[in-house]
């Protein structure tokens, strides 16, 4: 999986006027990183490993980005036409990547409403509108305030693009997000299900990095895909990942099924506990 | 009876200040986002403030700074404190539910509004 960093920056609009502050968030690699605190206007990291990355650096850097995006993003809703009563939100989302080859890919996206209007490769500055009436509408009036303003040009679109590869590169030089492995905790629970069997599910939680396999095993042979369901892996607030795989098997016949799980080069079994234990917890 | 009942109103020299109360019977105002709209004569209706039901609050850009909105939940009643009063600020003032929606001002729920003057 490449290597990412994803600006998420949200401004409010009420009855037409731009509403002081912002909310924004900042994703590497998948996990949450950063996020404006309004009350005290800092950027501030989520959790000891998104410290880590920066060590004893201050966030002023990040800081300043974010309450000049803010800005620029408040600026660009006031020039919305659309503004009518109540509550209305712009939503730019900012992301590039290094992928394994050295490749790099950015784009830039907006949101109004929650709804997708306009988006950005910021490489090749090709922009993309969706067809419906109100998305043209909504491009028409972001990309005429864009043009007008002098500093949204070719360069700034390649400052943007460099700027966010370069705080990508100056994180995963840190060595933190590339070095680290979290193994997973793995639970291994039962329930009843119809007359004469059970689901057995394989829950695996706070791992690291997200690329993991977990399968349910007969007699040491993986069942097929469509004997199985799994869940999404997803992050679980605390910088790691968490996902499950569940099947159905006759009771009676828990001894022939393992759940398998690898990650990070590392692998282990996990039976299914008896009827009497409820849950059975290891860490490998 | 649903009923919004609005007081407060009256006559300020310019630089003074009013507080304006809105006052529910027959509903729960913590449950519902509660704003404040004014008409001057002759003018269009326009959004003045909004507290939602977790406290955020909305300001319209010629009030900012001046006008602070509040609610107590417990005596099922929204604010408005309005300082540095301005002869533009002149209207009538109306409370209305749900004021996050796009057609707040024509809501089920407003007030017969009250008067706010301000003239030396």
């Known amino acids: 999986e490449p290597h990412s960093l994803r600006y998420n920056l949200t401004v409010l609009s009420w009855d037409g006027s731009v509403q002081s502050g912002f909310l924004a968030e900042v994703h590497l690699d998948g996990q949450p990183f950063l996020r404006y605190d309004r009350q005290k206007c800092r950027a501030k990291p989520q959790g000891q490993w998104a410290e880590d990355v920066l060590g004893n650096k201050t966030w002023d850097r990040e800081t300043r980005d974010l309450t000049g995006n803010g800005k620029d993003l408040r600026m660009t809703l006031a020039h919305i036409k659309d503004q009518k009563e109540g509550l209305h939100s712009l939503q730019e989302i900012r992301v590039c990547e290094i992928h394994e080859d050295n490749s790099t890919r950015s784009s830039q996206h907006f949101y109004y409403d929650g709804e997708l209007f306009l988006s950005q490769n910021l490489e090749t500055e090709e922009w993309t509108v969706p067809q419906s009436s109100r998305a043209q509408t909504l491009a028409m009036n972001v990309r005429n305030f864009l043009k007008e303003d002098a500093m949204k040009t070719k360069t700034h679109y390649h400052a943007m693009h460099a700027d966010c590869l370069q705080e990508l590169r100056r994180y995963l030089e840190s060595g933190v997000v590339l070095r680290r492995t979290v193994p997973p905790m793995v639970n291994v629970t039962r329930s009843e299900a119809s007359e004469g069997n059970i689901t057995v599910t394989c829950r695996a939680s706070s791992f690291y990095p997200r690329n993991i396999i977990l399968t349910w095993r007969q007699d040491g042979v993986s069942l097929s895909h469509d004997t199985q369901q799994w869940g999404d892996v997803l992050p679980d607030g605390n910088g790691t990942y968490q996902t499950w795989v569940a099947t159905r098997i006759c009771r009676g016949e828990e001894q022939r099924f393992t759940c398998y799980m690898e990650h990070s080069g590392n692998h282990s079994t996990h039976p299914v506990p008896s009827g009497k234990v409820l849950v059975l917890q290891s860490h490998w | 009876q649903v009923q919004l009942v609005e007081t407060g109103g009256g006559l300020v020299q310019p630089g003074g200040s009013l507080r304006l109360s809105c006052a529910a019977s027959g509903f729960t105002l913590e449950h519902y986002a509660i704003g404040w709209f004014r008409q001057a004569p002759g003018k269009e209706q326009e959004g003045v403030s909004c507290?939602?039901?977790?406290?955020?609050?909305y300001y319209a850009d010629s009030v900012k700074g001046r006008f602070t909105i509040s609610r107590d939940n417990a005596k099922n009643t929204v604010y408005l404190q309005m300082n540095s009063l301005k002869p533009e600020d002149t209207a009538v003032y109306y409370c209305a539910a749900d004021c996050l929606s796009s057609n707040w001002r024509t809501s089920a729920y407003w007030a017969q509004g009250t008067q706010v003057t301000v003239s030396s």
């Open positions: 507290i939602t039901s977790d406290g955020d609050t």
